[in-house]
Amino acid sequence: DSEEDEEHTIITDTELPPLKLMHSFCAFKADDGPCKAIMKRFFFNIFTRQCEEFIYGGCEGNQNRFESLEECKKMCTRDNANRIIKTTLQQEKPDFCFLEEDPGICRGYITRYFYNNQTKQCERFKYGGCLGNMNNFETLEECKNICEDGPNGFQVDNYGTQLNAVNNSLTPQSTKVPSLFEFHGPSWCLTPADRGLCRANENRFYYNSVIGKCRPFKYSGCGGNENNFTSKQECLRACKKGFIQRISKGGLIKTKRKRKKQRVKIAYEEIFVKNM
């Protein structure tokens, strides 16, 4: 497979703080698309953490493509004043930790976690699937790492942010060095088809990880899980062809293990929830 051939070994070198993405598409590779036009566009490079120029072919591609440098910066970089990244060990909680839990105006029965400022703990709540606010985490661990105090009142913040799969809010995603190199693609591709709790009968596709194929199922209209696609093509793109989207150009990131350079392979998952 040519995807495999493109996989590069990356020498780690310069130290960078954990990458915090404003939108998941900012992590996509620059994609010139199949057409042959020569159009100057800009994309966000997750290695250099800068917006850079590339040549776009004029069709298809992905959302990591901007008409101007300014637009790219606006969508994919944060000015220093708004950064969640802290340079000191004693870190403040991000403002969104103090928002009350908000299920949102939809009703999808999704288990999420929020930081309860009264109890000073992360707690479970039922999220509806749209809107709401940023105090909304997919796992208890993510919530704790972002919003709960660590030992001695220190804030633990080894986490980056990625776009929440359901409501355009920034949801913390671990970028601790060990896990950075252990992504295995969208986890929802491994989940069974889930009809959900409502009464509609919508034609959908899910990825059957046992047989490695996309299969149709009837969706009830709410609830369920992320293994749910409106077309077979979208299902295959997310779960089969793009199960792990390999990075095809070298980048320099430092790991701190044993104080020596290490040869590592980086893979990151391409997230199709925000086409996102």
Epitope: R107, G128, N168, N275
Partner: antibody, heavy 123, light 112 residues
Amino acid sequence: QVQLQQSGPGLVKPSQTLSLTCAISGDSVSSDSAAWSWIRQSPGRGLEWLGIIYKRSKWYNRYAVSVKSRITINPDTSKNQFSLQLNSVTPEDTAVYYCARWDSDKHWGFDYWGQGTLVTVSS
Amino acid sequence: DIVMTQSPLSLPVTPGEPASISCRSSQSLVISRGNTYLNWYLQKPGQSPQLLIYKGSNRASGVPDRFSGSGSGTDFTLKISRVEAEDVGVYYCQQYDSYPLTFGQGTKVEIK
């Protein structure tokens, strides 16, 4: 069949408070499968969402930033209705005001609308 | 705020012919569980808006199958396979990806 019946004055003086009510039949304002919103329409602005309330484990509201300092949307569970209050109005607030139900279960959209109330702000 | 931009603003149509309305969002809209966070409404003359297409591509109850919604990312389309006289009015797209909920400026469909 859900019905939304709007009531309230059609003429409001500048700097005064615009008050409208939306009476619900066929559903409950406290339903956890709906949310209740006010939207206005004017030639200059088109359809403009103003705010929404919804009951889950407790009451929540969200308002458009453009009117946040002036708007209140309240439920009245005893009368099964909800209201809009917009303070310190100016001629810019002249519009047709609609109440609408957001279907939280199936549609995830405004599936029922009131008949609309033309509110003119003028002295 | 996410700005929704529709085109054309006016669409003269011939009954029996197809029609297409475009809606572009200033930011990519969420696709989750196969749903796009975008709805389409039709406001017939002298009436309140009515829900036409929800979650990007699903027809609301009572909506004829000549109406279809499609698109993802920032580009969305409402298609009428064969326009009928009763389809005249103003069509609006609306996003619920993030607050504030925003509508397109509307496309007025009228019979030629």
